[in-house]
């Protein structure tokens, strides 16, 4: 999902800006930055979240806020501190003139400031409700465990908690932080105010139309009667959850955020902090038929972001728009004509559509999985959600062409049994943001903190790239792809796996002098090869073909072009075994694939040879895909021959551990 330096408007207020009337840069240390929503109508100028540096204490936050007020007063400006944050992010929410931003950015401890902006419920119809009875037989769906050990927090509108579908299942907290409704003639009708939240609570835990019928819920009101809220209100809600968790630790927590606003650094940061405190966050991808990475909290990497599909597993169209898509989406779930509790009456049902409904499905599935296995980490849960999803059922033609390869073709499903998946080696594919077209541009893909990067590949639509390499960053391996001169940009593709007690390292061989090609192998005892990468400095690799792809008896070896440096990912983990599988096609072809067989998991995917007509390699579920330039442009020379190389692994240790449990 979105990198921290996300694609949104960032104003570094170091130089004078005419628009905001700003002066010189801060005196000390690094420059604090100002951020605002890229979508102008959603901006809320006059209210700002001042985020302080990570280690700032509450007393320092309060002091900084008072200092801002005092300095503003000296300049004749009134300010109001609306909230002081602590527990999740240090900082404060302030109502003030934009003229004071320059002053605020110079305050001690300030990391960045973000202008407040709107967030919105992600369902339609908002008030065109159809009252319908549940359209199924209840005994068709009776899950083994209804999520009874899990608490699901819902940040949404007010809800009708005594609706027959959810009575006794939802505790309405006293938390409320919503903006005034728009329009002077707005009539606040209770049933409409409750519509969105009631429906979603029903989808998660409703007695008859719910996914996790045993889950208990707590609701926080962050959206008003028009389904509109603010980033700041959502932040304060997330902080409330964190404080509740600290005061009274319970079992696993799932937080459902069925809302979306423009990209927000601060909202994403808060989600990251809460996720790292052990909370599972599930959010709507957004209903804008757009790249989910442009929205928050959808773009937060730690959040499980859900797009919407219909009964035919096709992406949901919502009026002129539809579900969001792209690399920031983790998976899709049912989100069209979803039956759930209607706030029109205490026994009414209604169908609503949107990525909110899809996210509610996944929150319900997550609650059931966590109830069955309460010790699951966020990374383990995400991997299981992906693993048990229906694969390759979505018609990708609905997505823009450039987004198809980035969008996961996964529709959420309940596991056949909520237990017994522990023996599996789980892996997922993580795409980076696009590098951009400059000559030295790079793109970085990262795994979650408790995942292992087992391989790294790259992809460029133009084919102009300089490969990829695994490198250490902050004590963790990342996957970096390199653009080439004249290239339109590259993607880095990380293969991120759950491998307990793993010890992985990267072995590099520099470009070979001889014509034999470059090779590198895993020489440490007990280490197996999980992935191969190659990176080159020359603009265009020649047509050199390694004479021998892989000498017999040396499966732990990466081979590549003589002008490229080759990187082998070598891992030691209990019971880990891997094998190399190749599929070569002598004639030129736009796509070559090779898949791992049942019981084995794809950890590495690369192409041989690494010549410039190869666009790149990437993993889709358990299949390694190598893409080449259009055959009409390469002709049918031997250069067109491409081999897809998959590295397939399994863990005997995990399998044994699982058998001992059963």
């Amino acid at each position: 999902q979105e990198d921290e330096d996300g694609d949104y408007e960032e104003l570094v207020l170091a130089l004078r800006s005419e628009e905001d009337g700003l002066a010189e840069a801060p005196e000390h240390g690094t420059t604090a930055t100002f951020h605002r929503c890229a979508k102008d109508p959603w901006r809320l100028p006059g209210t700002y979240v001042v985020v302080l540096k990570e280690e700032t204490h509450l007393s320092q936050s309060e002091r900084t806020a008072r200092r801002l007020q005092a300095q503003a007063a000296r300049r004749g400006y009134l300010t109001k501190i609306l909230h002081v944050f602590h527990g999740l992010l240090p900082g404060f929410l302030v109502k003030m003139s934009g003229d004071l931003l320059e002053l605020a950015l110079k305050l001690p401890h300030v990391d960045y400031i973000e202008e407040d902006s709107s967030v919105f419920a992600q369902s339609i119809p908002w008030n065109l409700e159809r009252i319908t009875p549940p359209r199924y037989r209840a005994d068709e769906y009776q899950p083994p465990d209804g999520g009874s050990l899990v608490e699901v927090y819902l940040l949404d509108t007010s809800i009708q908690s005594d609706h027959r579908e959810i009575e006794g299942r939802v505790m309405v907290t006293d938390f409320e932080n919503v903006p005034e409704e728009d329009g002077t003639r707005f009539h606040r009708q209770a049933s409409k105010c409750d519509s969105h939240g009631t429906h979603l609570a029903g989808v998660v835990s409703g007695r008859d139309a719910g996914v996790a019928k045993g889950a208990s819920m707590r609701s926080l009101r962050v959206l008003n009667c028009q389904g509109k809220g603010t980033v700041s209100g959502t932040l304060i809600g997330l902080e409330f959850i964190r404080k509740s968790q600290l005061v009274q630790p319970v079992g696993p927590l799932v937080v459902l955020l069925p809302l979306a606003g423009g990209y927000s650094r601060v909202l994403n940061a808060a989600c990251q902090r809460l996720a790292r405190a052990g909370v599972v966050l599930v959010t709507a991808a957004g209903n804008f038929r757009d790249d989910a990475c442009l929205y928050s909290p959808a773009s937060a990497p730690e959040v499980i972001t859900v797009g919407a599909t219909n009964a035919q597993d096709q992406p949901v169209t919502l009026g002129t728009l539809g579900t969001n898509f792209g690399r920031c989406v983790d998976l899709f779930a049912p989100g069209e004509d979803i039956i759930g509790a209607s706030s029109d009456c205490s026994t009414c049902f209604v169908s609503q559509s949107g990525t909110s409904q899809a996210a509610a499905h996944v929150a319900g599935i997550a609650a059931m999985m966590l109830s069955a296995e309460p010790e699951l980490t966020l990374a383990e849960l995400r991997q299981r959600l992906i693993h048990f999803s229906a694969k390759d059922v979505i018609n990708e033609a609905w997505f823009p062409e450039d987004q198809r390869v980035l969008t996961p073709n996964l529709v959420a499903a309940l596991p056949p049994s909520t237990h017994g998946a522990g023996w599996q080696l789980f892996c997922r594919t993580v795409w980076s943001a696009h590098s951009g077209p400059t000559r030295m541009a790079t793109a970085v893909a990262r795994c979650a903190p408790d995942e292992e990067l087992l391989s790294c590949s790259s992809f460029s639509r133009s084919g102009k790239r300089r490969g990829e390499r695994m490198e250490a960053q902050g004590g963790k391996l990342v996957c970096r792809a390199h653009n080439a001169f004249g290239g339109e940009g590259v993607y880095a593709i990380a293969r991120c796996c759950l491998l307990p007690q793993a010890n992985c390292s990267v072995h590099t061989a520099p470009p070979a002098e001889a014509s034999m090609g470059t090779r590198v192998h895993c020489h440490q005892q007990g280490h197996v090869l999980t992935g191969c990468s190659s990176h080159w400095e020359v603009e265009d690799l020649g047509t050199h073909k390694p004479p021998v792809l892989r000498p017999r008896g040396q499966p732990n070896q990466c081979v590549g072009h003589r002008e490229a440096s080759i990187h082998a990912s070598c891992c030691h983990a209990p019971g880990l075994e891997c094998k190399v599988k190749e599929h070569g096609i002598p004639a030129p072809q736009e796509q070559v694939t090779v898949a791992c067989e049942e019981g084995w998991t794809l950890t590495g995917c690369s192409a041989l040879p690494g010549t410039s007509h190869v666009l790149g390699a990437y993993a889709v579920d358990n299949t390694c895909v190598v893409r080449s330039r259009d055959v009409s442009t390469t002709g049918s020379t031997s250069e067109g021959a491409v081999t897809a190389v998959a590295i397939c692994c399994r863990s005997r240790h995990l399998a044994q551990a699982s058998q001992e449990l059963q």
């Epitope: 549940p134 209840a138 009708q160 908690s161 005594d162 027959r164 309405v172 008859d208 205490s346 026994t347």
Partner: antibody, heavy 115, light 109 residues
């Protein structure tokens, strides 16, 4: 603990009205409505309707439409059931119960309609 | 709304198991997960024994169990005891209301 306490027995003449109260305690009021159920002597249970503490909404059994009114007063945590134009076949024990799930019941209020 | 159909009476000896059936339609029992069973001793208020087809509230003996197949729900009491002698009522959601069964008198011989 969760409790529903009902008002005392009533004796009414045919054509009169009766108003039975039910005071709730020990739980979050707005998470549940109140169901009203009656039981005529020697007969089974009959669901009469439901009323919300959250917004005052009601859901009446068809048989009761027009003759009964259910209300709540959240400030006193009390639900009320009023039955008008009483007939002798309204003689019964009237129970309030928590929500549609009816997991907790009041002790019952005997209403006798007799001339 | 017509009442759900229950046998008027069932009996069993101490230690035995008995089952009480509750038959409705696809618009009530068959259409919802919300079938409940209540026990009522003479002169007392009903007590919830089973909710949502097969769940037992805390404090209710595990000798009581519930199930459902199609439009018929069942209450099974195993290891029958003298104190189990009472009237038993089933209850189900309908699309807009609630409906009870006519009741079953359980006699422990």
């Amino acid at each position: 603990q969760v409790q529903l306490v009902q008002s005392g027995a009533e004796v009414k003449k045919p054509g009169a009205s009766v108003k039975v109260s039910c005071k709730a305690s020990g739980y979050t009021l707005t998470s549940y409505g109140i169901s009203w159920v009656r039981q005529a002597p020697g007969q089974g249970l009959e669901w009469m309707g439901w009323v919300s503490f959250y917004n005052g909404n009601t859901n009446y059994a068809q048989k009761l439409q027009g003759r009964g009114t259910m209300t709540t007063d959240p400030s006193t945590s009390t639900a009320y059931m009023e039955l008008r134009s009483l007939r002798s076949d309204d003689t019964a024990v009237y129970y309030c119960a928590r929500g549609y799930g009816m997991d907790v019941w009041g002790q019952g209020t005997t209403v006798t309609v007799s001339s | 709304q017509s009442a759900l159909t229950q046998p008027a009476s069932v009996s069993g000896s101490p230690g035995q198991s008995i089952t009480i059936s509750c038959t409705g339609t696809s618009s009530d029992v068959g259409g919802y997960n919300s079938v409940s069973w209540y026990q009522q001793h003479p002169g007392k208020a009903p007590k919830l024994m089973i909710y949502e087809v097969s769940n037992r509230p805390s404090g209710v003996s595990n000798r009581f169990s519930g199930s459902k197949s199609g439009n018929t729900a069942s209450l099974t009491i195993s290891g029958l005891q003298a104190e189990d002698e009472a009237d038993y009522y089933c209850n189900s959601y309908t699309s807009t209301s609630m409906v009870f069964g006519g009741g079953t008198k359980l006699t422990v011989l």
